[in-house]
């Protein structure tokens, strides 16, 4: 039966990004709609056929286009994605003989990781602090000299979106620890990124 | 050239079924929506339903309640429409059409088919 | 079923004159609307689709408008080989319906 491809795309927060749907048709469709879902009902934001051209909804005047003008394959590009464009969105393809057909495009949004690692000795010991924010929230793990050491993790949900992950490394005899190398390891959408510290007596 | 060309009259039974055969040439048939409709003697017309060589997909008119089947050979560049369980009613004559889009632009010679008893 | 109601149902003019039939729709059936002609024990013909776009090689004479649920037919000459029977077709949605017809006649 004609259905309608599409490809979910994950971008990074304040760039550009692009939905296609392709009708996988003999025919090109009347006229193409695309719409956000939403909870009650989806919202219309931009349409495209022959007889009117490109028309996009107020309240997406100057977020979309539609960048591929077709009437079988179909793009739109937000000029620079917020959180608020994250969700799913619904092409529909009005064709001549078997009405709506409709593909289902995704958008997920993300943030980098902005990573802090940091020492403090206090007494007699010694506790190495790495701490990672990102959307979605990342993963932190250490790489030590030596077995046994303690670590604590606190995950902190921030307002814009992104999750902060620190973790704290606790080493009871610092005097071990001074000139090696400690590797705090961050993972986040399926990439790990290592960021080494030396630890020197202050 | 174009050309859509239908199969020959026919006289039925009541309760019986007809086959229609539409054979396109001069053009690719996967790309055109074959429809048919029908007008009774005197009638407006009356569209049957369609179907995309493409994929095999076909929409039929719900008012004939399942007794209009609308296939496709496309190795014979033929499409094909059968009407089941025939009454006098549904004397009429047939055509095809082909379409690219909602741009209709060739049609059959028509067929007649008549049912009585 | 969407019902379309074409008016008049007959007409007598001459050649030369400017004929205009209407058909109406009974819901919003946008832009998607054609006309056909037809002649006795021919197959129908393809006049104008999407309300007003002309089918190639149909004259210029043939016109098209309307959206919504008005639709209207103009010729804008008759010709002695435009006489023959006239047809609306709406395709917004299905079952795709025409309209009762309208008979175009010599006066």
């Known amino acids: 039966q004609v259905q309608v491809v599409t490809q979910d795309e994950r971008e990074q927060l304040y760039t550009p990004a692009s939905l296609k749907c392709s009708l996988q048709n003999a025919q090109e469709a009347l006229i193409v709609t695309w719409q956000k879902k939403k909870a009650v009902s989806p919202e219309n934001m931009v349409t495209f056929s022959e007889n009117h051209g490109v028309v996009i909804q107020p309240a997406y005047k100057d977020k979309i286009n539609i960048t591929q003008l077709g009437l079988q394959n179909s793009t739109i590009t937000f000029w620079n994605i917020t959180l608020e464009d994250e969700g799913c969105y619904m092409c529909l393809f009005n064709t001549f003989g078997f009405g709506k057909i409709s593909g289902t495009a995704c958008l997920t949004v993300y943030v980098q990781p902005i990573v802090s690692l940091h020492y403090k000795f206090s007494e007699d010991h010694l506790n190495i602090t790495c701490s990672a924010t990102a959307r979605p929230a990342p993963m932190v793990f250490w790489k030590v000299p030596r077995s046994g050491i303690e670590n604590s993790t606190v995950t902190l949900s921030h307002p814009n979106g992104t999750t902060s992950v620190t973790s704290i490394l606790h080493i009871k005899d610092p005097k071990n620890q001074v000139g090696k190398e400690v590797i705090c390891q961050v993972l986040h959408l399926g990439t790990v990124t290592d960021f080494k510290q030396t630890v020197n007596k202050g | 050239q174009v050309q859509l060309v239908q199969s020959g009259a026919e006289v039925k039974k009541p309760g019986a079924s007809v086959k229609v055969s539409c054979k396109a040439s001069?053009?690719?048939?996967?790309?055109?929506?074959i429809l048919w409709v029908r007008q009774a003697p005197g009638q407006r017309l009356e569209w049957m339903g369609h179907?995309?060589?493409?994929?095999?997909?076909?929409n039929y008119n719900l008012k004939f309640k399942g007794r209009v089947t609308i296939t496709r050979d496309t190795s014979a560049s033929t499409a094909y429409m059968e009407l089941s369980s025939l009454r006098s009613e549904d004397t009429a004559v047939y055509y095809c059409g082909r379409s690219k889009r909602d741009y209709f632009d060739y049609w059959g010679q028509g067929t007649l088919v008549t049912v009585s008893s | 079923d969407i019902q379309m109601t074409q008016s008049p149902s007959s007409l007598s003019a001459s050649v030369g004159d400017r004929v205009t039939i209407t058909c109406k729709a009974s819901q919003d059936i946008n832009s998607y609307l054609s006309w056909f002609q037809q002649k006795p024990g021919k197959a129908p013909k393809s006049l104008i689709y999407r309300a007003n776009r002309l089918v190639d090689g149909v004259p210029s004479r043939f016109s098209g408008s309307g959206s919504g649920q008005d639709f209207t037919l103009t010729i804008s000459s008759l010709q002695p080989e435009d006489f023959a029977t006239y047809y609306c077709l709406q395709y917004d949605e299905f079952p795709y319906t025409f309209g009762q017809g309208t008979k175009l006649e010599i006066k």
């Open positions: 179907i995309d060589p493409y994929y095999g997909s076909s």
């Open positions: 001069g053009y690719s048939f996967t790309d055109y929506i």
